[in-house]
Amino acid sequence: CKAMHVAQPAVVLASSRGIASFVCEYASPGKATEVRVTVLRQADSQVTEVCAATYMMGNELTFLDDSICTGTSSGNQVNLTIQGLRAMDTGLYICKVELMYPPPYYLGIGNGTQIYVIDPEPCPDSDF
């Protein structure tokens, strides 16, 4: 049986504003119409769910209102943006893709994108 390959960049550096973007691309074995994308963060051996969205092919990704993630989809490619990152959020961000409909269900898990976040230096106090 075919595995479902999920590709994502190995390393991404967050911007000085704490925003990181990367592409999660999956090789779909069939014509999925409903796809679920989950971003997981792995630090040491602990894994936490960062955000998740289910979308219909051709439609926009919709994350929860309070989510730190936004994204767009194009074919088998999902462009993910994570905001509000700080240095302590540095870690391996794993893209999990599930083809929910039509059957059969498929699961694919990427190798992860190491996101480095560097907190900006505070501005020096001014004498003015």
Epitope: A3, M4, Q42, Q46, V47, Y105, Y106, L107
Partner: nanobody, 128 residues
Framework: EVQLVESGGGLVQVGDSLRLSCAAS????????IGWFRQAPGKEREFVAT????????????YYADSVKGRFTISGDNSKNTVYLQMTSLKPEDTAVYYC?????????????????WGQGTQVTVSS
């Protein structure tokens, strides 16, 4: 080579609960997906639930057949190399031989053809 042994089956009443166990030996199952399937007399083998791990972590991802969603829960104990299927609110139509199987950690996890290793099965009978 992975050997799988199921246990916990039996005769129960409608509405009762039962917990099935699938013990793996020969290799750690954290690099596999473990699936539960069932086969009722005169029917084809059908998918019930599956669990898969992100390597080197305790994070698991699960998926269920619509017919058991909300009633059955699949879980795993890596230290014991055992996967459990907790079944509640059992119905007569849940009567079947339940098999556990091991296959690749990603891919079409609801298809029995994905799984290369199978246990001998355990009988579950729900009487009204």
């Amino acid at each position: 080579e992975v050997q799988l042994v199921e246990s916990g089956g039996g005769l129960v009443q409608v509405g009762d609960s039962l917990r099935l166990s699938c013990a793996a030996s020969g290799r750690s199952f954290e690099n596999y997906a473990i699936g539960w399937f069932r086969q009722a007399p005169g029917k084809e083998r059908e998918f019930v639930a599956t669990i898969s791990w992100i390597p080197r972590t305790a994070y698991s991802t699960t998926y269920y057949a619509d017919s058991v969603k909300g009633r059955f829960t699949i879980s795993g104990d890596n230290s014991k190399n055992t996967v459990y299927l907790q079944m509640t609110s059992l119905k007569p139509e849940d009567t079947a031989v339940y098999y556990c199987a091991a296959g690749g950690a990603t891919g079409p996890l609801a298809l029995d053809s994905h799984y290369g290793y199978w246990g001998q099965g355990t009988q579950v009978t729900v009487s009204s």
